[in-house]
């Protein structure tokens, strides 16, 4: 469905302003911050969500070893520039004319520079590793059950096609979810792994982006799965370009 017609809200993005001013009096929703129209039948892009967040009033061994090129979002929040499709622009700058290049999930992938910095293309993040630690339980979860429920979650809540959930690894209490999506695999209408990972991250933090839905309540055979920490690693189709100074710091 698009924006809920009865009370004109956006089920997939509560950081919107909605009104019945679309064609034929249909409900149309615009993202806070950017004012861009959003499709409420699917996830909103991370760029528009970050922009909306910055505009809102401030108020919180079988396991995979991330590769040497994996990025972690250490820079935190910033007010991004989004293109007309809602994607991150390859080059981001702050108010003091400090610029840097980002990948498709908005994570910095170069050293910071000045306005002369060039970012030729938006490099796609094709592999995301979500590393979770769950709270202690009476016993370990069954790996197959955990895999089934996490796949169901990404499929049902985030509408991510199962083929993009490459693997679910488990060594109690660590769970790793691998999302993979090459440019060639992503068809029109497919949810982007970066957007799904961002919605999941916000859900885990108890900051759900969905309108009116309860927070994330994940259970495996009736046993609550409560996450106590999350780390997300991003791998790009082209390795990031940082100076040796950063790498040895």
């Amino acid at each position: 469905h698009t924006a809920a017609q009865d009370n004109c809200t956006c089920p997939t993005n509560k950081m919107t302003v909605c009104s019945p001013d679309g064609p034929g009096g249909r409900c149309q929703c615009r993202a806070l911050g950017s004012g861009m129209a959003v499709d409420c039948s699917t996830l909103t892009s991370k760029c528009l969500l970050l922009k909306a967040r910055m505009s809102a009033p401030k108020n919180a061994r079988t396991l995979v070893r991330p590769s040497e090129h994996a990025l972690v979002d250490n820079d935190g929040l910033y007010d991004p520039d989004c293109d007309p499709e809602g994607r991150f622009k390859a080059r981001q700058c702050n108010q003091t004319s400090v610029c840097w290049c980002v990948n498709s999930v908005g994570v910095r992938r170069t050293d910071k520079g000045d306005l002369s910095l060039r970012c030729d293309e938006l490099v796609r993040t094709h592999h995301i590793l979500i590393d979770l630690r769950h709270r202690p339980t009476a016993g370990a979860f069954n790996h197959s059950d955990l895999d089934a429920e996490l796949r169901r979650l990404f499929r049902e809540r985030y509408r991510l096609h199962p083929k993009f959930v490459a693997a679910v690894h488990y060594e109690q209490p660590t769970i790793q979810i691998e999302l993979r999506q090459n440019t060639s695999q992503k068809a029109a209408g497919d949810v982007d792994i970066g957007d799904a990972a961002y919605y999941f991250e916000r859900d885990i933090k108890g900051e759900s982006l969905f309108q009116g839905r309860g927070g994330l309540d994940l259970r495996v055979r009736g046993e609550p799965l409560q996450v106590e920490r999350t780390l997300i690693y991003y791998l790009d189709e082209i390795p990031p370009k940082f100076s040796m100074k950063r790498l040895t710091a």
Partner: antibody
Framework: QVQLQESGPGLVKPSQTLKLTCTVS?????????WNWIRQPPGKGLEWIGY???????LYNPSLKSRVTISRDTSKNQFSLKLSSVTAADTAVYYC??????????WGQGTLVTVSS | DIRMTQSPSSLSASVGDRVTITCRAS??????????LHWYQQKPGKAPKLLIY???NLESGVPSRFSGSGSGTDFTLTISSLQPEDFATYYC?????????FGQGTKLEIK
């Protein structure tokens, strides 16, 4: 022992709304799992209609989504199916079933609903 | 939607026979850990009964003469030695993708 029992009218007129209820005993529907409706037209195969989860989330078969609502009453440990604008093609045995981790381990005995004027 | 195709549609066999039913999915229903393919038995006028879950796991209380195998798109249900109570219709079901879908069924009859 988990048990599911369907109830509701056996005859519905065309264009009306079919309403069925599944009463669950032996397990609280808000404690876990996914609570499904599945149907089987006479002499035919099985068709998944949709579910309501332990937390109240819904998922429906896109082929029926515009006509289906699955809701629950946790105080009675029941979940219900509403199918609007029915036609003769909706004549079927309707089953409720529990989805454990994406397979159906417990089923109701089924109830035949005939759509006819 | 994932299309599930069972073969044969019907099968005549005798008590004591070894019987194999196959189920083919229109796309893979496996993950790195799981095979989201399940088998059910249905007798006339009764609800389906779970036999095998995740391709090869025998549901509690189901006789060991039933077994399942396969991965990806091709799966098999085997009954090692048919018993009189096994004459029924068998369905496969995938749960890798929404909507969940079932095979058209295989009717197992007495020869």
């Amino acid at each position: 022992q988990v048990q599911l029992q369907e109830s509701g009218p056996g005859l519905v007129k065309p264009s009306q709304t079919l309403k069925l209820t599944c009463t669950v005993s032996g397990y609280s529907i808000s404690s876990g799992y996914y609570w499904n409706w599945i149907r089987q037209p006479p002499g035919k195969g099985l068709e998944w209609i949709g579910y309501i989860s332990y937390s109240g989330r819904n998922l429906y078969n896109p082929s029926l989504k515009s006509r289906v609502t699955i809701s629950r009453d946790t105080s009675k440990n029941q979940f219900s199916l509403k199918l609007s604008s029915v036609t003769a093609a909706d004549t079927a045995v309707y089953y409720c079933a529990r989805d454990t981790t994406a397979y159906f381990d417990y089923w109701g005995q089924g109830t035949l609903v005939t759509v006819s004027s | 939607d994932i299309r599930m195709t069972q073969s044969p549609s019907s099968l005549s066999a005798s008590v004591g026979d070894r019987v194999t039913i196959t189920c083919r999915a229109s796309e893979s229903v496996s993950s790195s850990v799981n095979r989201f393919l399940h088998w059910y038995q249905q007798k006339p006028g009764k609800a389906p009964k779970l036999l095998i879950y995740r391709a090869s796991n025998l549901e509690s209380g189901v006789p060991s003469r039933f077994s399942g195998s396969g991965s990806g798109t091709d799966f098999t249900l085997t009954i090692s030695s048919l018993q009189p109570e096994d004459f029924a219709t068998y369905y496969c079901q995938q749960s890798n993708e929404d909507p969940y879908t079932f095979g058209q069924g295989t009717k197992l009859e007495i020869k």
